[in-house]
Amino acid sequence: VPRWRQQWSGPGTTKRFPETVLARCVKYTEIHPEMRHVDCQSVWDAFKGAFISKHPCNITEEDYQPLMKLGTQTVPCNKILLWSRIKDLAHQFTQVQRDMFTLEDTLLGYLADDLTWCGEFNTSKINYQSCPDWRKDCSNNPVSVFWKTVSRRFAEAACDVVHVMLNGSRSKIFDKNSTFGSVEVHNLQPEKVQTLEAWVIHGGREDSRDLCQDPTIKELESIISKRNIQFSCKNIYRPDKFLQCVKNPEDSSCTSEI
C-alpha cells in the first residue's frame, strides 16, 4: 500500500538533486583554488542534513549552520554586487569583472542556484513530487530559509560601496517584497557601508528616461538614507554596451554614457 504523501503547491525537488549539488561542488572547488580544501561529500551531507527527515514547513536558519560552516569563504567586503530581478546580467557582469561577487559566485550560492529541494517529516526520502510554495503553503520551507539566510549574511558582510543591479523594465524597479528589498537592504551595516549605488538597467533600445527618478527608486533612497547610508543611482541605458565596456574599457566608444 503506497504511503500517503503531502501534496504541496510548488514544484518538487529538482531531479538528480544530490548528483547536481555534488557535481557543482566539485566543479567550484576545481575552479577556485582557495576552496580546494573543501570536502564535497561532507558539504552534501551537511546540505542534506538541513532538510532531510524534517517537516518542510519547519526549517530554521540553524538547520543550515553546519553547511555554512563547511562553506566558509572570504570575499572582499567592498566587492559585493547585489541584484534584483536581473540575475543573468549580474552574473554576466561578475564573469567579466572577476574581482566582484554576487551571492551565486560564492560556493553556497553556486550550489543552490535555480534548484528546488525539500524532504518529508520522519522519512529519509527527498520529495521529488512537490515542495511548499512560499505564498500558498509556508515561508519556512527549505529553499526560502536557505536564501533568506545566505542573503542576510551576504548583505551583513558588505562594506564601503555596495552595488545593486535593478531591472528598469519591471513595473516596480525596486520591489520591497524581493529578497533584496525585504532582506538585503535591511541587513546592510551602517557602521561598515558608506554608499549603496543602484544601477538601473534599461530594457528598451530607445529608452532615454531617467529611471533613477522612478518612485520606487525614491522609496529605496528613503529607506537607505534613514539607515544612515548614502545612496546613489546610475542609469545603464545600454546593458550590451555596458558589458562590452567592462570587457574593453579602452574602447573609444566607452567614454560616453552607457
Epitope: M68, Q73, A157, C159, D160, E191, K192, Q194
Partner: nanobody, 121 residues
C-alpha cells in the same frame, strides 16, 4: 588566522609625541571597529580610542585633544597619533580589531601583543 602587529612604541619625554601603528594580516573579509587599549602596571586594561570603518571615532576623556586615531581600510591598518604625552600615559598599548574572516560567520575580536609606551618626566 589573523595577526595584529603593533609598532611605534618607545621611550619619550613628557610633552613629546609618538605614533603607533597596527596592521591586521591574514585572510580577512572585513574589519569593522579598530581601536587602541592600554594597560598600566597593576591596573585594568582601558579603552583609549576606537574608530569604525566609516571613520566615526570615540576617545576616553583623558586623551581627548591630545590623541588622534585614524585608519586606512585598504591596508587594514589603524594609527594612534599621541601628542603632549604625560607620565600617566605610560602603559602597554594594545591594538584591537573586530574582524570578519568568513562571509557566513560573525566578526570576532582580535588583539595584538602590545607595544610599550614609556613617558619620562
Amino acid at each position: 588566522q589573523v595577526k595584529l602587529e603593533e609598532s611605534g612604541g618607545g621611550l619619550v619625554q613628557a610633552g613629546g609625541s609618538l605614533r603607533l601603528s597596527c596592521v591586521a594580516s591574514g585572510t580577512i573579509v572585513s574589519i569593522s571597529t579598530m581601536g587602541w587599549y592600554r594597560q598600566a602596571p597593576g591596573k585594568q586594561r582601558e579603552l583609549v580610542a576606537t574608530i569604525t570603518r566609516r571613520g566615526r571615532t570615540n576617545y576616553t576623556d583623558s586623551v581627548k585633544g591630545r590623541f588622534t586615531i585614524s585608519r586606512d581600510n585598504a591596508k587594514n591598518t589603524v594609527y594612534l597619533q599621541m601628542n603632549s604625552l604625560k607620565p600617566e600615559d605610560t602603559a602597554v598599548y594594545y591594538c584591537n580589531a573586530e574582524v570578519q574572516l568568513d562571509i557566513w560567520a560573525s566578526a570576532y575580536d582580535y588583539w595584538g601583543q602590545g607595544t610599550q609606551v614609556t613617558v619620562a618626566s
